[in-house]
Amino acid sequence: FERTRSLQDPCSNCPAGTFCDNNRNQICSPCPPNSFSSAGGQRTCDICRQCKGVFRTRKECSSTSNAECDCTPGFHCLGAGCSMCEQDCKQGQELTKKGCKDCCFGTFNDQKRGICRPWTNCSLDGKSVLVNGTKERDVVCGPSPADLSPGASSVTPPAPAREPGHSPQ
């Protein structure tokens, strides 16, 4: 089939980085500057993406692959192929249309992007809170209250294991 296709369509022999030039009797010509073809058999080369302004060049365009952009520090990429730049926030914040706002009590965000998420509810797993949550960090769940030694509060770590044969003081 490939052999048949080649006989029918001389353009199928043109490799990536070239195009099948109809103006030159279907000879494979190299892509002109600032253009590329990422697959063989192309009749035209695509124009390279230009990373302008706040879009910075992460990878230069070559004859076989498009340029890749990222965003200036302070912003991060969104969308296919970094089609948008969205502002970063600090940990403990989320982005709203009013800008970066602190996470509400009971929620956290440990990244520069994304939304504030509720703290883990330790009691749903029958566990206690070992370390309280903050705007930047989730709670740390510890053993279940029943596993704690008598008198221990839910926010303190369990007492160290005792040697066999010793009774509590």
């Epitope: 969104l78 969308g79 948008m84 730049c85 969205e86 502002q87 982005l95 709203t96 249309k97």
Partner: nanobody
Framework: EVQLVESGGGLVQPGGSLRLSCAAS????????MNWARQAPGKELEWVAN????????YYVDSVEGRFTISRDNANNSLYLQMNSLRAEDTAVYYC????????????????WGLGTTVTVSS
């Protein structure tokens, strides 16, 4: 071609005022949120202000609240930033940016940016 072109930057003394303009072309301006962002020398890019499609919602970063005013003229495809009581720390390249489709709902990404206009506040 979709394009944003800023103008109006320059040198101004502390306490002075400037009005930046952004001319939009190649897209339906009135259907997009629009933004201003800035990058001070040696600092990260910072969002400054945004405005919704009809100008009824406007938001600002805390550091410019009460001093800067964002506005738009949909009939003339123009965005503005009136900057009053300017300070040395407002020195930056100011960028106009279009909110992408879904801005304010699913994300706050900006997909079209101008090349910027430079504001220098110095005595």
């Amino acid at each position: 071609e979709v394009q944003l072109v800023e103008s109006g930057g320059g040198l101004v003394q502390p306490g002075g005022s400037l009005r930046l303009s952004c001319a939009a072309s190649g897209f339906t301006f009135s259907t997009h949120w629009m933004n201003w962002a800035r990058q001070a020398p040696g600092k990260e890019l910072e969002w400054v202000a945004n405005i919704n499609q009809d100008g009824s919602e406007k938001y600002y970063v805390d550091s410019v609240e009460g001093r800067f005013t964002i506005s738009r003229d949909n009939a003339n495809n123009s965005l503005y930033l009136q900057m009053n009581s300017l300070r040395a720390e407002d020195t930056a390249v100011y960028y106009c940016a279009r909110g992408g489709v879904g801005y304010g709902d699913s994300h706050f990404g900006m997909d079209v940016w101008g090349l910027g206009t430079t504001v220098t506040v110095s005595s």
